[in-house]
């Protein structure tokens, strides 16, 4: 069962796996959640009468029974991992810890204006795990305003001590705030020859890449496939690093694949979740349980529902014996990966899906899109919302996109005539406008945040955020879309769709059913040629067919231009303006969301 509560002045006795240092009990809980085996933890706070060298220790624990005896201890804070919980979990920690020195290997020392600048440097440095910044009141004059970038073998501090007039914090790479390049290519027949920092067993190159991304020091990797000539190295995933962050040598070798960590684009790429099934594959590891059940999907569900289970192998029944039930072997290991992989024994293997909730909800696979036709089907565009205005009469005003559990991204021009958020309602999970009745649940709008440089749609900055009055629980019909990664500036999106309930032609009415249209992106140069009297800036993005015929129109404003890349949907544009609707050689103009990622994050993550 999920226990989120922290127990003050309580120590969990026994079950120790390892001890790390964390600046708070909450951070200790997150570290425990991300550790392959940790189910419980005890944190020693600075209020503890214990020797100060024990302050900030985070003791990660495991227990077969998933519980441990509780002992009274002043200053100890204990709790459970979020592994047992269904809510989204993030490794993102934006806190700045005052009068705290988080120790690690300092590898860069430079002067910074403030702690935010220091944190930004850390976030945009591939090696940095955390930083310490000496404030302008630090006693040693020459050390004032010094920003120390640090890393460790584990990604957590080697020690934490109290120190006046310094502040410490973590890299925000896991908050999707890094500007580092995001190299998603997999290089076939390639071995990166740099030294290994670790090696694990993986069934394919994509699992290897996710493991590398999740590892604090892995910057790139090499994976030896099951056809690799040296048997003892088959399915081996070699995690690597280098000072420059790039492989120093690439060697051509068949049956090997190499690639890079996705640490700087991890918000829009599933890095924890390994959802695939591996047929005719047996994962070896420590056996947790053996259960009779029907089918490998049921076996995966069983593994996901069992806190200590990390991976499984399902052995299908022979013929029709045992009522069609096979054996489900629930397994675990010290690092969450199989100790060995065997083929040709008829098993079907896979991983627990409980790690999927550690990925951003926007990366969750949605129902396959229905190709052809204009009308959407339920669950096809779960981020699309309809924004209603209730005064003087209730009607659809604009589209919008869910980007967080309390945030909708839409167009600023939707609010040209809106005086107060009180007259707005957000309906999510809606396919047909006719579904909306008096008693249909909605989200009230607490705040409208319009970009302060917005004047009119045609001059740009046509972007606004709606802060909802209550938080949204994600379901199959309402969940967020990923923002494009700032490190992905070179991505060329091809699979792009515009959706909305807007007019189908210029003189028309709002549609009942959510409409969809696949539309190709148009270069800004081409778009500028079509709109000579306007300035098409890099903060705009255009889409449309040369011959016209498909476009966004009145009522679609604020809605998404959604593009699928690497199996993940990204909010590339916000429907903004255009000359007529679907006119020949008049593409639609959309707000270029990637240019506003900093603005979005600044507004949505303000305290």
């Amino acid at each position: 069962e999920c226990v989120t509560k922290l127990f003050k002045d309580i120590y969990f006795q026994g079950g120790d796996i390892t001890t790390v240092f964390t600046p708070s009990a909450k951070h200790c809980q997150v570290v425990c959640t991300h550790h392959p085996r940790c189910l419980l933890f005890t944190f020693i706070a600075e209020s503890s009468p214990e020797d100060p060298t024990k302050w900030f220790t985070c003791i990660l624990k495991d227990s077969v029974t998933e519980t441990l005896p509780m002992v009274n201890m002043t200053g100890a804070i204990s709790g459970y991992s979020f592994k047992q919980c269904s809510h989204q979990i993030s490794a993102c920690n934006k806190n700045i810890y005052v009068d705290v020195d988080m120790k690690g290997l300092n590898y860069n020392s430079s002067i910074a204006k403030n702690a935010q600048e220091c944190q930004e440097r850390c976030t945009n440095d591939m090696h940095c795990h955390f930083f310490t910044y000496a404030t302008r009141w630090f006693p040693s004059v020459e050390h004032r305003n010094i920003c120390l970038l640090k890393y460790t073998q584990t990604g957590t501090p080697t020690r934490i001590t109290k120190l006046s007039e310094v502040v410490s914090g973590f890299s925000l790479k896991s908050c999707a705030l890094s500007n580092l390049a995001c190299i998603r290519d997999i290089f076939p027949s390639t071995v990166f020859a740099d030294s290994n920092i670790d090696s694990v067993v993986a069934p394919d190159v994509f699992v290897c890449r996710r493991i590398c991304t999740h590892h604090p020091n892995c910057l790139f990797f090499t994976f030896f496939s099951q056809e690799w000539p040296k048997e003892s190295e088959r399915n081996l995933c070699l995690l690597k690093t280098s000072v420059s962050g790039l492989p120093s040598t690439r060697i051509k070798k068949n049956k090997a694949l190499s690639g890079f960590s996705l640490q700087s684009c991890r918000h829009s790429v599933p890095v924890f979740c390994h959802p695939s099934f591996y047929h005719d594959t047996d994962f070896l590891g420590e056996e947790l349980d053996i259960v009779d059940m029907k089918g490998h999907e049921a076996c995966q569900k069983m593994c996901t529902d069992t806190s200590r289970c990390q991976f499984f192998t399902y052995s299908p029944p022979h013929e029709s014996c045992n009522g069609g039930k096979g054996k489900c072997y629930l397994k675990l290991s010290s690092n969450g990966s199989p100790t060995k992989i065997l083929y040709g024994r008829g098993g079907i293997s896979g991983y627990t899906l409980r790690l999927c909730k550690m990925d951003n909800a926007c990366t969750t696979k949605i129902k396959p899109r229905v190709v052809g036709g204009r009308a959407s089907v339920p669950g096809e565009w779960p981020w699309q919302i309809t924004l209603h205005i209730i005064s003087p009469t209730q009607k659809h005003l604009c589209g919008g996109s869910i980007i967080g559990n309390q945030w909708i991204l839409t167009a600023a021009h939707c609010f040209d005539e809106v005086e107060s958020p009180k007259i707005l309602r957000v309906y999510s999970g809606i396919l047909n406008q006719s579904e909306i009745k008096e008693d249909t649940s909605f989200f009230a709008v607490q705040e409208i945040i319009i970009h302060d440089q917005y004047e009119i749609a045609e001059s740009g900055y046509d972007i606004a955020l709606l802060k909802l009055g209550t938080t949204m629980n994600y379901t199959d019909s309402q969940r967020p879309i990923c923002l494009p990664s700032k490190g992905d500036t070179n991505v060329i999106y091809s699979d792009c769709w515009v959706t909305g309930w807007g007019y189908r032609k210029l003189r028309d009415k709002i549609q009942n059913t959510l409409q969809k249209a696949e539309i190709p992106l148009v270069t800004n140069e081409e778009c500028q040629r079509r709109y000579r009297s306007h300035k098409i800036t890099d903060k705009m993005i255009c889409a449309g067919y040369k011959e016209g015929g498909k476009d966004a129109c009145k009522g679609d404003s604020g809605g998404p231009l959604s593009c699928k890349h690497n199996e993940v949907w990204h909010l590339v544009g916000i429907t903004s303006w255009g000359e007529g609707c679907a006119h020949r050689e008049r593409p639609g103009v959309y707000t270029n969301v990637v240019k506003y990622v900093d603005w979005i994050l600044e507004k949505t993550q303000a305290p």
Partner: antibody, heavy 116, light 107 residues
Framework: QVQLEESGPGLVAPSQSLSITCTVS????????IYWVRQPPGKGLEWLGM???????DYNSALKSRLSISKDNSKSQVFLKMNSLQTDDTARYYC??????????WGQGTTLTVSS | DIVMTQSHKFMSTSVGDRVSITCKAS??????VAWYQQKPGQSPKLLIY???YRNTGVPDRFTGSGSGTDFTFTISSVQAEDLAVYYC?????????FGGGTKLERL
């Protein structure tokens, strides 16, 4: 683990120059300042100067004109050069790592004798 | 330049005694003072930095206090292995400087 090791000539004639190397391991010179400190036989510690992680330098005012500190980050080495040596420069020379102005790790030191 | 003065060159003590060594700065150095221990034939060892912060692994019998210009280093209960020379150092402003040292010897 963190280590610092000084290596020097041992004996230098008066008016000659001195060059001592401090080779470090277990940490990066881009992230830490390195100090030079000397101790004449039977006397106290004297601060000579330092080089910061970003390459800036600071020197003891009295010795500034004779001292020069540099480093090679890739080789993990810091260099102390001192010219116009006199007999009162005879001392044990230490390099030490910076921790907010204090020195948390020291080398074993290298003895320099200035004598003809 | 800042001058650090340790008024006692020598101090006599017995095992179990409480002993305090003082250090005076020629100008305000805030709380940027460190204390080192040096035994014969060895390199100095950092005990205290920024007036009162104990370095990793330093026993809690060693403490430091003070601010501005007057600083004190205290050993609450002297052990035989504590007999050594103790130096203060200001790390407020470069050029950093050491005190002349105080030798702690057996009574």
């Amino acid at each position: 683990q963190v280590q610092l090791e000084e290596s020097g000539p041992g004996l230098v004639a008066p008016s000659q120059s001195l060059s001592i190397t401090c080779t470090v391991s277990g940490f990066s010179l881009t992230g830490y300042g390195i100090y030079w400190v000397r101790q004449p036989p039977g006397k106290g510690l004297e601060w000579l100067g330092m080089i910061w992680g970003d390459g800036r330098t600071d020197y003891n005012s009295a010795l500034k004109s004779r001292l020069s500190i540099s480093k090679d980050n890739s080789k993990s080495q810091v260099f102390l050069k001192m010219n116009s040596l006199q007999t009162d420069d005879t001392a044990r020379y230490y390099c030490a790592r910076d921790y907010y102005g204090s020195k948390d790790y020291w080398g074993q030191g290298t003895t320099l004798t200035v004598s003809s | 330049d800042i001058v650090m003065t340790q008024s006692h060159k020598f101090m006599s003590t017995s095992v179990g005694d409480r002993v305090s060594i003082t250090c005076k700065a020629s100008q305000d150095v805030s709380t940027a003072v460190a204390w080192y221990q040096q035994k014969p034939g060895q390199s100095p060892k950092l005990l205290i930095y920024l007036t009162s912060y104990r370095n990793t692994g330093v026993p809690d019998r060693f403490t430091g206090s003070g601010s501005g210009t007057d600083f004190t280093f205290t050993i609450s209960s002297v052990q035989a292995e504590d007999l050594a020379v103790y130096y203060c150092q200001q790390h407020y402003k470069t050029p950093y400087s050491f005190g002349g040292g105080t030798k702690l010897e057996r009574l």
